[in-house]
């Protein structure tokens, strides 16, 4: 039970107090009890209960004729059953007794307040009222654990505006409201319980810019909504009439969990005595409600599909027709982005991050904006971002930002145990250099700060600073499985390269040619690949490079060698030792549920079709996934990027709520 | 072939910052490295910065680190020095080169080494 | 000081060939085939004459060849010209932290 106030009672005068139901309030009886008195025996109204405990011995007795001896060890509490009809009328008598003198009486008269603010602390989705208790001031995870979620209300429910719903101090429509979370205030006083008394919302200052709060006056109309507490303001004086009434507030928060917000917010409503107009207010009661903000979750490739973006560009028409077939065979949504809008930046899954956020009562996809800022720059803000989509960025927007800041460079694996630690919505993967130097690159430390911040997807970081472009999404990708952990990690493997083209110059295939078929290209044979020690010691590195990754992500994600299928591909380190795809780069791939838009190789034809595709084929094709090999040569390939790097996708959220999980 | 031009350059104060650019004509800047290179009245070539045609990471002399910045803008096919915290030791005609990035080459062929494309260059002058 | 060493001058006549001197460290000259050479009159560009230490530009005449041995790397220009007289200056890729560097420069004077 929450903690109420002390009331010290003295004989010379009747006291006044207020008791909050649910709260218990300390009576103090001995620092005005008359001098030659020794006990005191205590009478009440039926609507008053008494405690009294005496310590030592830590005996407990209910009321009644029982004398008590006047010593500090004494603890009298009391509680009260109902709110009172009117000022005063319950009554606790104390009666002081010594050897010598008849009973001396102190008398308190008690008026009983039902205050109570109350939000979705068991996170069903409904709102129940709560008296004043303790659990309501803490924020527990895990399935057994409570306390209220917010959301950040950063989606565009105006498609006239170009502003998030956050930005503004207005209620659009009940859609708005839906995005925002309940918060009741319930009051049971006698009727003019609130001439002497006033109630005031309020939120730290610490963290009123993180947070607004919307009164709902007469109805639930959103046009009916004020603010009443937000980055301006942080309090409250609130106008509550006697007797029973119940008001409600709609609360929005405005800012992720980030480096300096650890996303918890509390609202308190304070009870201030405000009868004695010559004298301060003062605090009677106060009671808060804690609210987490809900963090942005990374959805993986294992999760259903549900809509997929590509940009349209100069000659890119057979590849649009092969993902938008693709698209068509998941049963995805396909959303193409025309060239006068991506100002000939075709490289999709760079600009952005599709992920959500979840409150019980409702889910909103967001899209995290990169700080590339490149041609494509306009599109999640004018083209994403919308009604129930929401929006969010982090990061310089001017320069400052280096290759890694892209989201090729932003993966996140499917959900994994590692060792007694659960990871119900996996883990956050992105690559960095392996040591700071002169001209070592890393993504920016706000998007790191960010992305640790949200709790709920520890992230791991890769080493991807070898390769040319320096995102993950070169050298790994995830698909789902039917068995043992649901999904298997693919990785890019020149050892599997050599080997397999070992084994058909071995049958007699040593003069079949890669890139056949591509105009303005070196056709080389499998002979001359295989006898280049410079491409080999190239590969050698690169190799040494992906087994770092490996046995990080083996470590991190609790994975065995059976979790992870080596996909065979080739590099070539350019200029400044950076490695880049020598033909096209097949772990960069789309994964559609279990259709895969891969990059087609243009390996050696042998027996009428290519090896790569041959050995990739068998390798997924056992775990159900169909394999679609698309060519991305000219428009992709020779610009240093690959069907996953102009694609992006958003994807079913989790059935997995994430305040069931303990971070 | 491309052709480079620079701009930008200018009498500047000690301290003061200038951005120089390299528009290029005849060709997609995209498809190419770009380096800068500068040269000192009177004194021999030096090598300043380089920016890769993906665009994705960037290299500078230990001279100037940290107070220089090489960027491309590929839909303007310009690429920029940010010159910012300049010195007296700075002053010079700055050079903006080129070389073409061969997707073709087996493995790396050290275009981002040499330069065979040359803009005129541009003066830069930091005096008080 | 630049980090490649060259002489400062170098001359010779109409008709005669000169070799002109990069060294440079194993960490340069001697790791990487990543030498280039190039030629700059009064008041011009640079202009790429050799890359890859050896290899000659579409456009630029036989008489120029380019050589290396451990980490010195040779400019050689037979059958001497007039309009050779210039200023030649080598370059290599390096392992610091400076990734290119460029010799001093020789003052080539045809007599």
């Known amino acids: 039970m929450a903690q109420g106030t002390l009331i010290r009672v003295t004989p010379e005068q009747p006291t006044h107090a207020v008791c909050v139901l649910g709260t218990l309030t300390q009576l103090d009886v001995c620092s005005s009890a008359p001098e030659d008195c020794t006990s005191f025996s205590v009478n009440t109204s039926p609507g008053v209960v008494v405690d009294i405990a005496h310590s030592p011995p830590a005996k407990k007795k209910s009321t009644g004729s029982s004398t008590w001896p006047l010593d500090p060890g004494v603890e009298v509490t009391l509680t009260m059953k109902a709110a009172s009809g009117s000022t005063g009328d319950q009554k606790v008598q104390i009666s002081y007794h010594g050897p010598k003198t008849p009973p001396v009486k102190a008398l308190l008269y008690l008026t009983g307040v039902e205050i109570s603010l109350s939000a979705d602390i068991t996170r069903t989705g409904k709102v129940k009222p709560t008296r004043a208790v303790e659990d309501k001031r803490t924020w527990t995870w895990g399935p057994c654990g409570q306390g209220a979620i917010l959301l950040v209300n950063c989606d565009r429910d105006n498609p006239e505006s170009s502003a998030m719903d956050c930005e503004d101090d207005e209620v659009l429509d009940s859609k708005d409201l839906k995005d925002m979370s309940l918060m009741t205030l319930s009051t049971k006083t006698p009727q003019d319980f609130f001439t002497r008394h006033t109630l005031v919302l309020h939120v730290a200052r610490s963290e009123m810019d993180k947070v607004r709060v919307f009164q709902a006056t007469r109805g639930r109309l959103s046009s009916r909504c004020r603010v009443v507490l937000g980055p301006k303001q942080p309090s409250h004086y609130l106008m509550v009439p006697g007797g029973k009434h119940n008001m409600d507030f709609y609360v929005e928060a405005l800012a992720f969990p980030d480096t300096n917000f650890p996303g918890l917010i509390t609202l308190t409503v304070s009870m201030l005595d405000t009868s004695k107009l010559e004298l301060p207010e003062a605090v009677v009661f106060q009671d808060s409600v804690v609210f987490r903000v809900a963090p942005w979750i990374m959805t993986p490739n294992t999760q259903p599909p549900q809509e997929v973006y590509v940009c349209s560009i100069f000659e890119n028409e057979d590849f649009l027709k092969s993902v938008t077939a693709l698209a068509m065979q998941a049963r995805c949504k396909l959303t193409i982005c025309p060239e006068e809008e991506n100002m000939d930046d075709q490289w999709m899954q760079d600009e952005m991050e599709i992920g959500y956020i979840q409150a019980p009562h409702k889910t909103l996809p967001v899209v995290f904006d990169s700080p590339r800022n490149r041609g494509l720059k306009e599109f999640p803000i004018k083209r994403v971002m919308g009604p129930d989509f929401g929006y969010v960025t982090r990061g310089p927007q001017t320069g400052g930002v280096s290759g890694l800041d892209s989201f090729g460079n932003l993966e996140v694996s499917p959900p994994v145990t590692v060792g007694d630690k659960e990871y119900p919505l996996g883990r956050i993967l992105f690559g960095d250099s392996c040591y700071p130097s002169s001209d070592s690159r890393e993504m920016h430390q706000a998007l790191q700060d960010f992305l640790s911040a949200q709790q709920v997807q520890a992230p791991v970081k890769l080493y991807s600073d070898w390769l040319t472009v320096g995102h993950v999404d070169e050298f790994l990708s995830f698909v789902p499985a039917p068995d043992r952990k649901g999904f298997r990690l693919l990785l890019a493997s020149p050892r599997s390269c050599y080997k397999l083209f070992q084994e058909q110059q071995n049958e007699g295939h040593g003069d079949a040619l890669l890139f056949q078929g591509i105009k303005k290209k070196n056709q080389q044979k499998i002979k001359n690949i295989l006898s280049n020690t410079t491409l080999r010691e190239h590969n050698s590195f690169v190799e040494r490079c992906i087994d770092w990754n490996r046995e990080l992500l083996k470590r991190e994600l609790g994975l065995a060698e059976s979790d992870i299928i080596d996909i065979p591909q080739l590099f070539k380190l350019k200029e400044f030792s950076k490695a880049e795809a020598f033909f096209p780069n097949m772990v960069n791939m789309l994964v559609l549920g279990k259709h895969l838009g891969i990059p087609k190789p243009f390996g050696p034809i042998i027996n009428g079709r290519c090896c790569l595709e041959e050995k990739v084929c068998s390798l997924l094709e056992p775990l159900g996934l169909h394999c679609t090999f698309i060519n991305d040569f000219y428009t992709y390939h020779i610009r240093h990027g690959e069907v996953h790097c102009g694609t992006n996708v958003r994807r079913k959220p989790f059935s997995f709520k994430w305040w069931n999980m303990v971070p | 072939q491309v052709q480079l031009v620079e701009s930008g350059g200018g009498l500047v104060k000690p301290g003061g910052s200038l951005r120089l650019s390299c528009a290029a004509s005849?060709?997609?800047?995209?498809?190419?490295?770009v380096s800068w290179i500068r040269q000192a009245p009177g004194k021999g070539l030096e090598w300043v910065s380089f920016?890769?045609?993906?665009?994705?990471?960037?290299y500078y002399a230990d001279s100037v680190r940290g107070r220089f910045t090489i960027s491309r803008d590929n839909a303007k096919n310009t690429v920029y020095l940010q010159m910012n915290s300049l010195r007296a030791e700075d002053t010079a005609v700055y050079y903006c080169?080129?070389?073409?990035?061969?997707?073709?080459?087996?493995?790396?062929?050290?275009?981002?080494?040499?330069?065979?494309?040359w803009g005129r260059g541009t003066l830069v002058t930091v005096s008080s | 000081q630049s980090a490649l060493t060259q002489p400062r001058s170098v001359s010779g006549s109409p008709g005669q060939s000169v070799t002109i001197s990069c060294t440079g460290t194993?960490?340069?000259?001697?790791?990487?085939?990543?030498v280039s050479w190039y030629q700059q009159h009064p008041g011009k560009a640079p202009k790429l004459i050799i890359y890859?230490?050896?290899e000659r530009p579409s456009g630029v005449p036989d008489r120029f060849s380019g050589s290396k041995s451990g980490n010195t790397a040779s400019l050689t220009i037979s059958g001497l010209q007039a309009e050779d007289e210039a200023d030649y200056y080598c370059?290599?890729?390096?392992?610091?932290?400076?990734?290119?560097?460029f010799g001093g420069g020789t003052k080539l004077t045809v007599l």
């Open positions: 370059s290599s890729h390096s392992r610091s932290s400076t990734p290119v560097l």
């Open positions: 920016i890769p045609s993906a665009n994705t990471f960037t």
């Open positions: 005849g060709s997609t800047l995209s498809d190419y490295f």
């Open positions: 890859n230490v050896y």
């Open positions: 194993r960490g340069d000259v001697g790791r990487y085939n990543h």
């Open positions: 080169s080129s070389a073409n990035d061969d997707v073709d080459d087996i493995v790396a062929p050290g275009r981002g080494y040499y330069m065979d494309v």
